[in-house]
């Protein structure tokens, strides 16, 4: 199996976009419905 970094979000592999969950620490709201930071 090819190695992927899970925190990268998505990577190009054989010209195909492969997506992985991002680390919750990415602070960008990758998790649907999870409150991130404060109200900005």
């Amino acid at each position: 199996d090819a190695e992927f970094r899970h925190d990268s979000g998505y990577e190009v592999h054989h010209q195909k976009l492969v997506f992985f969950a991002e680390d919750v620490g990415s602070n960008k709201g990758a998790i649907i419905g999870l409150m991130v930071g404060g109200v900005v």
Partner: antibody
Framework: QVQLVQSGAEVKEPGASVKVSCKGS????????VHWLRQLPEKGLEWIGR????????IYTPKFQDKATLTVDTSTDTAYMELSSLRSEDTAVYYC?????WGQGTLVTVSS | DIVMTQSPLSNPVTPGEPASISCRSS???????????LYWYLQKPGQSPQLLIY???HLASGVPDRFSSSGSGTDFTLKISRVEAEDVGVYYC????????FGQGTKVEIK
């Protein structure tokens, strides 16, 4: 009150397009990813895709790659989802989500 | 696609009693980083869904601690220690190891 406010219900004919909006109220929508999901009548949830408002990067579930187009207008703190070539099977409630906030849902009905 | 399968599809419960919902994924959601990419959502009648549990066993903000989740790489359980009337609705498990996919939902209603 912090919320995401979506545009109202739409009725469209097959083959038409529709653009659903999602505006941040008391919330800067351009800071976090905006996710879009749909819920078919009496059915479960499907993730359509998401957009990073900072750079416009999008990622879609493959089945929606040619169906949905996600955009954000950071000047008005509004996210948009445009659906093209509508079919009766696209009749659903569509939700936007950003951080911990969900829109109220927009019912799109496709009927001739 | 990773397929999420829930059981039961309907779960009549008694207030004050415990309840549980099962969810199975077609592929292990345990990543080598040690995190399990399994989520639980609740959609109360007439409302938008809300996040209950993230990454298998983390309670989302504001969610009562009567909710808990556990599991292995492919088999998961959401438990409510003592059901309250406000817990009725449709519960969905979901994964985001590869994109996002959801289970078909389990309707929890009061007996």
């Amino acid at each position: 009150q912090v919320q995401l406010v979506q545009s109202g219900a739409e009725v469209k004919e097959p083959g038409a397009s529709v653009k659903v909006s999602c505006k941040g109220s008391g919330f800067n929508i351009h800071v976090y990813y905006v996710h879009w999901l749909r819920q078919l009548p009496e059915k479960g949830l499907e993730w359509i895709g998401r957009i990073d408002p900072e750079n416009g990067e999008t990622i879609y579930t493959p089945k929606f790659q040619d169906k949905a187009t996600l955009t954000v207008d950071t000047s008005t703190d509004t996210a948009y989802m445009e659906l093209s070539s509508l079919r009766s099977e696209d009749t659903a409630v569509y939700y936007c989500v950003s951080s911990g906030y969900w829109g109220q849902g927009t019912l799109v009905t496709v009927s001739s | 696609d990773i397929v999420m399968t829930q059981s039961p599809l309907s779960n009549p419960v008694t207030p004050g009693e415990p309840a549980s919902i099962s969810c199975r994924s077609s592929k292990s959601l345990l990543h080598r980083n040690g995190k399990t990419y399994l989520y639980w959502y609740l959609q109360k009648p007439g409302q938008s869904p809300q996040l209950l549990i993230y990454q298998m066993d983390h309670l989302a903000s504001g969610v009562p601690d009567r909710f808990s989740s556990s599991g292995s790489g492919t088999d998961f359980t959401l438990k409510i220690s003592r059901v309250e009337a406000e817990d009725v609705g449709v519960y969905y498990c979901a994964q985001n190891l590869e994109l996002w996919t959801f289970g078909q939902g389990t309707k929890v209603e009061i007996k």
